[in-house]
Amino acid sequence: ESGYAQNGDLEDAELDDYSFSCYSQLEVNGSQHSLTCAFEDPDVNTTNLEFEICGALVEVKCLSFRKLQEIYFIETKKFLLIGKSNICVKVGGKSLTCKKIDLTTIVKPEAPFDLSVIYREGANDFVVTFNTSHLQKKYVKVLMHDVAYRQEKDENKWMHVNLSSTKLTLLQRNLQPEAMYEIKVRSIPDHYFKGFWSEWSPSYYFRTPEINNSPGEMD
């Protein structure tokens, strides 16, 4: 079957809502950047629909996206990262809808990893550490991190701490004793770039110790 729409197909297409959103990931694979777009409406029939980006590219005028199930994806070194590009949904060579976007304003960082929590008995606190691939990157190096933790039994009662470093101290006195906690972290560009929260890191689980009363203390 031809990838080109018949006139009837175009008329039908024009009735649909082709709103879409995109995010970029810079230096996601060595010096390669990626751009991912998807339709806002998950029920859009994507047969014959293509995405194309034009402008603010190096050495080429336009690039076509690859389709992976319901998302559209490019991995390339050819993003100039200066100025606005035009991203269009096309059918049969005709643009249905377009957006002008500066790719440095829709950056989604990679998820943090290696999250761990160490209890320091003498200090009566928990040291939370994690890693991020962005420390090694040329562009998106400065991130704000959101550490979220909750007592496992409190399903929706998340506590959040924002920080720019990859180390956080939680005081034992601010946590319930003898309780299981879940903790996770995500990142967002904080300076020079704009965009979206990363995916959450895998959760880490830790248990708080019971309160040990000193010999002189009353129950």
Epitope: C54, A56, I82, G83, N86, T104, T105
Partner: nanobody, 118 residues
């Protein structure tokens, strides 16, 4: 009504330095890419350098890489071109441009003249 005003040009000896400034009165300056170009007598206008909205990303032509540096101050609505190790062939009129939108610069200044004597 004037939107981009370049300054800092002049006569300089080969090997010397100059710093050009371009002040913008365009309201979207802090979210716009900026660029510097030059036009030598009898030649086409050539791209020299560009900088992204935040200053984090820069791009240079091979002819000025390592000698010229583009920077910006979003609080002052100004973009700069620091030019070192100037050569006679750098002589020309220097223009700044704003808002690189799908491969077209939307706004242009009137330019400032730079003359490098050997």
């Amino acid at each position: 009504d004037v939107q981009l005003v370049e300054s800092g040009g002049g006569l300089v000896q080969a090997g010397g330095s100059l710093r050009l400034s371009c002040e913008s009165s365009i309201s979207t300056f802090s979210s716009d890419a900026m660029g510097w170009f030059r036009q030598a007598p009898g030649k086409e206008r050539e791209f020299l350098a560009a900088i992204g909205w935040s200053g984090a990303v820069t791009h240079y032509s091979d002819s000025v890489k390592g000698r010229f540096t583009i920077s910006r101050d979003n609080a002052k609505n100004t973009v700069y071109l620091q030019m070192n190790s100037l050569r006679a062939e750098d002589t020309g009129r220097y223009y700044c441009a704003e808002d690189y939108d799908t491969d077209v610069w939307q706004y242009w200044g009137q330019g400032t003249q730079v003359t490098v004597s050997s």
